[in-house]
């Protein structure tokens, strides 16, 4: 058993049918010695008396808010949560496996640049009685500071019969140098509590591996005289690290017909312009990627050929 | 990814082309190592990230773009002195910092070159003959060093009398390639920045 926060405790259980569970001793936080009784949640049934209460925690029915009283007055509370260990592996019931970029990916994180700011998000089908708390650091043995905000519900989607909820959090490394070569990964830890179930999820990454630039901005077309060709131009996104000559991007320019089946013409360039043939009803899209370290491509910025 | 390779203009900063080749070569070598050593811990998540140049050179700090010198987190000032007569500086008015930067890059390359050559000698003794260093990568390191053209004492190749542990050598190769790829990215950024200024 360990303390998650004041008066909230997590009982770790080897979770299998007929398991013996864990013996837990609760102590009433009071100078009183006599006439103390204990109850669980809203029930008025007295579970025991005395300054301490010994319970065998086996299942969720044994978890909840234990309260010690004296003469009708509440003295203190202890909330017991359960953390299930199933065959040596901590349960992951609360969050959905996003399966990207690999199986067992519960937290996904992205950064728009090298400033040390990043966003993580996760999915669940649970709509109520759910709380999250996020902590982060650079490295784990001698951790350096990363400050995270509160997790917020950022999207709701309908997936088949189920509703899916996306939560996200923004974090900022306290003293980040955009040019630094990372040798210790960022660690992100999310505590999830659903009713009386506790779970924790972690992700470990280097900022350089989660970079996904914003799409190029100011995408414009300039027709070339007496030609079907157009000059496409764009700019670096505002959120990208500066100076751009140091944090350079490379670009992919795509000409796509109306039909998805039509052949796509693609050109790669390090410049912020390109000359392409504009077909009728086609659209031109441009996306960006770090020129020197191949992390994710940005989303496409698009303009119609007409 | 297969991107068209830009050939440098004659007036272009002489080292940019070499640094682009270097990054391409080390990335290819790392990919090859990951595939060949699939049963070894060779991914970024599995290896310890060690920097053999730590406390010996200060490339990131010495080559910091002017715009980032206002960022206190980037000014991890380390006193390091280097020789300053590189040919990449030809026909350009350069500051002491720029010379310091390029000589720091040269020292990095020299250190990695020694490590890679020592390691290759061990790998050549492996009866499994599973993996060797790409000669192209070693040649590209050499070309960039020549382009930088700094006078520096030659570091003797490390020789080891004990029987090599091939498993450890291969893991060390992965660690070294990951670190060198990160340094090659920094070098490329620096060359691109200097070329633009």
């Amino acid at each position: 058993i360990w303390e998650l926060k004041k008066d909230v405790y997590v009982v770790e259980l080897d979770w299998y049918p007929d398991a013996p569970g864990e013996m837990v001793v609760l102590t009433c936080d009071t100078p009183e010695e006599d006439g103390i009784t204990w109850t669980l949640d809203q029930s008025s049934e007295v579970l025991g008396s005395g300054k301490t209460l010994t319970i065998q925690v086996k299942e969720f029915g044994d978890a909840g808010q234990y309260t010690c009283h004296k003469g009708g007055e509440v003295l203190s509370h202890s909330l017991l949560l359960l953390h299930k260990k199933e065959d040596g592996i901590w349960s992951t019931d609360i969050l959905k496996d996003q399966k990207e970029p690999k199986n067992k990916t519960f937290l996904r994180c992205e950064a728009k640049n090298y400033s040390g700011r990043f966003t993580c998000w996760w999915l669940t089908t649970i709509s109520t009685d759910l709380t999250f708390s996020v902590k982060s650091s650079r490295g784990s043995s001698d951790p350096q500071g990363v400050t995270c905000g509160a997790a917020t519900l950022s999207a709701e989607r309908v997936r088949g019969d189920n509703k899916e909820y996306e939560y996200s959090v923004e974090c900022q490394e306290d003293s980040a140098c955009p040019a630094a070569e990372e040798s210790l990964p960022i660690e992100v830890m999310v505590d999830a509590v659903h009713k009386l179930k506790y779970e924790n999820y972690t992700s470990s990454f280097f900022i350089r591996d989660i970079i996904k630039p914003d799409p190029p901005k100011n995408l414009q077309l300039k027709p070339l005289k007496n030609s079907r060709q157009v000059e496409v131009s764009w700019e670096y996104p505002d959120t990208w690290s500066t100076p751009h000559s140091y944090f350079s991007l490379t670009f992919c320019v795509q000409v796509q017909g109306k039909s998805k089946r039509e052949k796509k013409d693609r050109v790669f360039t390090d410049k912020t312009s390109a000359t392409v043939i504009c077909r009728k009803n086609a659209s031109i899209s441009v996306r960006a990627q770090d020129r020197y370290y191949s992390s994710s491509w940005s989303e496409w910025a698009s303009v119609p050929c007409s | 990814r297969n991107l068209p390779v830009a050939t440098p203009d004659p007036g272009m900063f002489p080292c940019l082309h070499h640094s682009q080749n270097l990054l391409r070569a080390v990335s290819n070598m790392l990919q090859k190592a990951r595939q060949t050593l699939e049963f070894y811990p060779c991914t970024s998540e599995e290896i310890d990230h060690e920097d053999i140049t730590k406390d010996k050179t200060s490339t990131v700090e010495a080559c910091l773009p002017l715009e980032l010198t206002k960022n206190e987190s980037c000014l991890n000032s380390r006193e390091t002195s280097f020789i300053t007569n590189g040919s990449c500086l030809a026909s350009r008015k350069t500051s002491f910092m720029m010379a310091l930067c390029l000589s720091s890059i040269y020292e990095d390359l020299k250190m990695y070159q020694v490590e890679f050559k020592t390691m290759n000698a061990k790998l050549l003794m492996d009866p499994k003959r599973q993996i060797f260093l790409d000669q192209n990568m070693l040649a590209v390191i050499d070309e960039l060093m020549q382009a930088l053209n700094f006078n520096s004492e030659t570091v003797p190749q490390k020789s080891s009398l004990e029987e090599p542990d091939f498993y450890k050598t291969k893991i060390k190769l992965c660690i070294l390639l990951h670190a060198f790829r990160i340094r090659a990215v920094t070098i490329d950024r620096v060359m691109s920045y200097l070329n633009a200024s």
Epitope: W15, Y16, A19, E59, E86, I89, D93, K102, N103, K104 | -
Partner: antibody
Framework: QVQLVQSGGGVVQPGRSLRLSCAAS????????MHWVRQAPGKGLEWVAF????????YYADSVKGRFTISRDNSKNTLYLQMKSLRAEDTAVYYC????????WGQGTMVTVSS | SYVLTQPPSVSGTPGQRVTISCSGG????????VKWYQQLPGTAPKLLIY???ARPSGVPDRFSGSKSGTSASLAITGVQAEDEADYYC????????????FGTGTKVTVLG
């Protein structure tokens, strides 16, 4: 004590269907994940499928994906395996088992796919 | 389809020490715990070892398990006639959990 009693096995022609059941008692069935494991005659153990305690997630071996469906009825304390498009290579003893560090197995039920 | 490799058979005379190996990889045994089962002919498997080296109550202490790196082993010290059975190791793969990964199985023969 914990008990898993299996039923539903038998002889079936290739291409036909069969449903296996596993009735649980002696524990809170709705709190635990469940597996199906099979063993072809004279061969080793092969995992078939898993279902979460609440039925929200199901996992299958590649060899049965798209043909077999694992399900549970927590109100009846019963686990099921619906097997469709059966093949000769599905011939085996099928076991249900609880998920956890200490597990309990059903007695097994024989499924023979033969023409 | 078996990722955990066991020797097909091992044998020993009563009282001898018999060991069975189970060889896997970094993503399975290297990252997860190992179980061992005993299966007597015509019966369901019986759990002998869980969590690499822990014995459930009722399992004789002549059975012991261990794990090192990407391999695990089961030892029977002072093998007895009633130990003649098939033995299976089991683990998980970190990418496909909760799918069970079973070993190829080992037939233990007690001679004499």
């Amino acid at each position: 004590q914990v008990q898993l009693v299996q039923s539903g096995g038998g002889v079936v022609q290739p291409g036909r269907s069969l449903r296996l059941s596993c009735a649980a008692s002696g524990f809170t069935f709705s709190s635990y994940g469940m597996h199906w494991v099979r063993q072809a005659p004279g061969k080793g153990l092969e995992w078939v499928a898993f279902i979460r305690y609440d039925g929200s997630n199901k996992y299958y071996a590649d060899s049965v994906k798209g043909r077999f469906t694992i399900s549970r009825d927590n109100s009846k304390n019963t686990l099921y395996l619906q097997m469709k498009s059966l093949r000769a290579e599905d011939t085996a003893v099928y076991y249900c088992k609880t998920h956890g560090s200490h597990d309990n197995w059903g007695q097994g039920t024989m499924v023979t796919v033969s023409s | 389809s078996y990722v955990l490799t066991q020797p097909p058979s091992v044998s020993g005379t009563p009282g001898q020490r018999v060991t069975i190996s189970c060889s896997g990889g970094r993503s399975n045994i290297g990252s997860n715990t190992v179980k061992w089962y005993q299966q007597l002919p015509g019966t369901a498997p019986k759990l002998l070892i869980y969590g690499n080296d822990a014995r459930p109550s009722g399992v004789p202490d002549r059975f012991s398990g261990s794990k090192s790196g990407t391999s695990a082993s089961l030892a029977i010290t002072g093998v007895q006639a009633e130990d003649e059975a098939d033995y299976y190791c089991q683990s998980y793969d970190r990418g496909t959990h909760p799918a069970l990964l079973f070993g190829t199985g080992t037939k233990v023969t007690v001679l004499g």
